[in-house]
């Protein structure tokens, strides 16, 4: 039994790492391997992560974490019963996939304005909350020509865009997704999307 | 919100011992170490050790080897500090401070004097 | 005695920029990350930068942090009488990281 494909590693520096890797041949991971890790820190235990299969010959792993800081490195060691297949280490803070964003909302009720709202994915005190910026898509599928990101900068989980500048009488989505500039970091995945119905019409000129 | 209630201050003769309490609540006890800290009338200050919850595992500054214990009890999401064979110069104000970096808030600080 | 170093005071008037900084060496700063507290007087201490340069939620923007080879720096814009407090430096020591030291400190006056 040999790994193919050594294993990857990211964290949303919150609470779990995703680490992922292929094998030799076809392996049923729960039932042949384990990934050892420990927090190469004083006082740290050793941890077992047991492996899904991720096709035939991958393998996923969801590692716990807690109080992720930039300084933490941990050692990862993948064994097949007795037999050690790899030894690595992995430093969350430099393979950071940040949560996606949730509760995307479009309230239509504001005047001549659509705002889109969304949550931050992590609570006030995590180190993540104050660096995320965002990306917000909208796109329509009665237009398949209009598809257009909106970088949000600035910390507030809002956007407003003019209702005049989208068609009217057409259906929209809207879906958001984060990043984290201090870290680095690699795009969220997408927020599940959300649909409106634009009805503003402009005024009759005078 | 996170919160963390140290015991109430403390009067001790020589060579006694000191057992202060850091209450946690509003986050998941185990999943953040837990530092003790002190700082002397006027003076800065000073690192002491640091437990890890889950386990109970630690480790003491060199200067208090030997003379701090720390504890915890995690059905009442409670660390312990106890200091033994006090002298005059652990009078101080002892804080309690969660996560590797310290995060906010701490303790509010538990007075210790130390005096004959 | 602390092995990282601050001056005792520092002092300047309300709207005016303050640095205070703090030396170490290569088995702290230099192979760590710094973090920065404030002690208000009477109060517990808080945390007001960590990683160098990063700021927890609820920090004004008006304090920054740097850190070059051993040394590491707190700057403070804007001044304000509020400002007026103990700010100690700390990091993390030893391979593995098993102690944490705090700086001497440094009394911040505000005239």
């Known amino acids: 039994m040999k790994v193919l494909q050594e294993p990857t590693c990211v964290s949303d520096y919150m609470s779990i790492s995703t680490c992922e890797w292929k094998m030799g041949g076809p392996t049923n991971c729960s039932a042949e391997l384990r990934l050892l890790y420990q927090l190469v820190f004083q006082s740290s235990e050793t941890h077992t992560c047991v492996p899904e299969n991720n096709g035939g010959v991958g393998c996923v792993c969801h590692l716990l974490m807690d109080d992720v800081v930039s300084m933490d490195n941990y050692t990862l060691d993948l064994w097949a019963g007795q037999q050690l297949l790899w030894k690595g280490s992995f430093k969350p803070s430099e393979h950071v996939k940040p949560r996606a964003p949730g509760n995307l909302t479009v309230h239509t009720n504001v005047s001549d304005t659509v705002l889109l709202t969304w949550s931050n994915p992590y609570p006030p005190d995590n180190y993540l909350y104050n660096d995320l910026t965002y990306a917000v898509n909208i796109w329509s599928e009665n237009d398949p020509a209009y598809s257009r990101i909106h970088n949000v900068t600035y910390l507030k989980p809002t956007l407003r865009i003019p209702a005049s500048t989208l068609k009217s009488g057409i259906s929209y989505r809207a879906r958001v997704r984060a990043w984290a500039q201090h870290y680095n970091t690699t795009w969220s995945e997408w927020s599940p999307s959300t649909k409106w119905y634009n009805s503003y019409r402009e005024p009759f000129e005078q | 919100q996170v919160q963390l209630v140290q015991s109430g201050a403390e009067v001790k003769k020589p060579g006694a011992s000191v057992k202060v309490s850091c209450k946690a609540s509003g986050y998941a006890f185990t999943s953040y170490y837990m530092h003790w800290a002190r700082q002397a009338p006027g003076q800065g200050l000073e690192w002491m050790g640091i437990?890890?919850?889950?386990?109970?595992?630690?480790s003491y500054a060199q200067k208090f080897q030997g003379r701090v214990t720390m504890t915890r009890d995690t059905s009442t999401s409670t660390v312990y500090m106890e200091l033994s064979s006090l002298r005059s110069e652990d009078t101080a104000v002892y804080y309690c401070?969660?996560?590797?970096?310290?995060?906010?808030?701490w303790g509010k600080g538990t007075l210790v004097t130390v005096s004959s | 005695q602390s092995v990282l170093t601050q001056p005792p005071s520092v002092s300047a008037a309300p709207g005016q920029k303050v640095t205070i900084s703090c030396s170490g060496g290569?088995?702290?700063?230099?192979?760590?990350?710094v973090s920065w507290y404030q002690q208000l007087p009477g109060t517990a201490p808080k945390l007001l930068i960590y990683d160098n340069n990063k700021r927890p939620s609820g920090i004004p923007d008006r304090f920054s942090g740097s850190k070059s080879g051993t040394s590491a720096t707190l700057a403070i814009t804007g001044l304000q009488t509020g400002d007026e407090a103990d700010y100690y430096c700390g990091t993390w020591f030893g391979t593995p990281a098993s102690n944490y030291v705090f700086g001497t400190g440094t009394k911040l006056t505000v005239l």
């Open positions: 401070a969660r996560g590797k970096l310290l995060k906010n808030p």
């Open positions: 290569s088995s702290n700063i230099g192979n760590s990350y």
């Open positions: 437990i890890n919850p889950s386990g109970g595992s630690t």
